[in-house]
Amino acid sequence: IPAPSIRLVPPYPSSQEDPIHIACMAPGNFPGANFTLYRGGQVVQLLQAPTDQRGVTFNLSGGSSKAPGGPFHCQYGVLGELNQSQLSDLSEPVNVSFPVPTW
């Protein structure tokens, strides 16, 4: 099944202490999906979209960006025929970067 879209939700972090907000959206015909956020292949957080919604926002507290392991991806799962779970492809990566201090 198709990969979700992924994007940072503003405000964008300006330091490692700032929270990070990441939105994942399934295609319109997959509402109520279960979403998983990964960083460098490691599960960061799981969220289920409401039954009438096709997306979620992962809210990560400040300091989450210090964890090693590369960019964020997300994936969603839905129940297919015979109640079997189907997983989507992984989203494109999203990288979190911080402005270079000006002092």
């Epitope: 939700v9 096709r54 997306g55 979620v56 926002t57 400040g62």
Partner: antibody, heavy 122, light 111 residues
Framework: QVTLKESGPALVTPTQNLTLTCTVS??????????WGWIRQPPGKGLEWIGS???????YYNPSLKSRVTISVDTSKNQFSLKLSSVTAADTAVYYC??????????????WGQGTLVTVSS | QSVLTQPPSVSGAPRQRVTISCSGS????????VNWYQHPPGKAPKLLIY???LLPSGVSDRFSGSKSGTSASLAISGLQSEDEADYYC???????????FGTGTKLTVLG
């Protein structure tokens, strides 16, 4: 049911500082799903976003007001506050506090206070 | 000066349909989702539409939103007297790094 209520002076003298407080009832200010913001409406004009704060203390401000604005949060009192320095008559407005919810892949202001009119005059 | 432009006023008779436009640029509407707020006189603003076209629970389905490129629209069908209010589009502006509201549109229900 979440309610927000603004409190503070109705009249401020030019060059003075304005401090407003928003008290949140019916929900925790410390949820990771919300920012808490201030928005104002000068008489006869439109809505203008002032700035917002996360429960952890992270803030972001309207660039046009940034040099004069400080927003702080007191999670123990379930309150957040706005301080606007060196006010002028142009700061006369109805000031609203509001909750910004992160949900469904985006965000929106879903709960608002009733607003408080602040007049800057000598 | 708002970066989102709306018509100052629109009007319509009861049961008619009106639309309110909101024009921006790539850094705001073009790359970010749009919300709409209803602001009745003397009251707090109320969320009407979020994520371009989604309806919050409790909001009448007479309201609908759409977006194309760097413009967004709010449509109100079956106009009622209680729809009289100011309406604002709102989004994020990546260049300003902040929330922006439209200039606002006053809706008058005739008769």
């Amino acid at each position: 049911q979440v309610t927000l209520k603004e409190s503070g002076p109705a009249l401020v003298t030019p060059t003075q500082n304005l401090t407003l407080t928003c008290t949140v009832s019916g929900g925790s200010i410390s949820s990771s799903s919300y920012y808490w913001g201030w928005i104002r409406q000068p008489p006869g004009k439109g809505l203008e976003w002032i700035g917002s704060i996360y429960y952890s203390g992270s803030t972001y401000y309207n660039p046009s007001l940034k040099s004069r604005v400080t927003i702080s949060v007191d999670t123990s009192k379930n309150q957040f506050s706005l301080k606007l320095s060196s006010v002028t008559a142009a700061d006369t407005a109805v000031y609203y506090c509001a909750r910004r919810r992160n949900s469904s892949g985006w965000f929106y202001f879903d709960y608002w206070g009733q607003g408080t009119l602040v007049t800057v005059s000598s | 000066q708002s970066v989102l432009t709306q018509p100052p006023s629109v009007s319509g008779a009861p049961r008619q349909r009106v639309t309110i436009s909101c024009s921006g640029s790539r850094s705001n509407i073009g790359d970010n989702a749009v919300n709409w707020y209803q602001h009745p006189p003397g009251k707090a603003p109320k969320l009407l539409i979020y994520y371009d076209d989604l309806l919050p629970s409790g909001v009448s389905d007479r309201f609908s939103g759409s977006k194309s490129g760097t413009s967004a629209s709010l449509a109100i069908s079956g106009l009622q007297s209680e729809d009289e209010a100011d309406y604002y589009c709102a989004t994020w502006d990546d260049s300003l790094n902040g929330h922006v509201f439209g200039t606002g549109t006053k809706l008058t229900v005739l008769g």
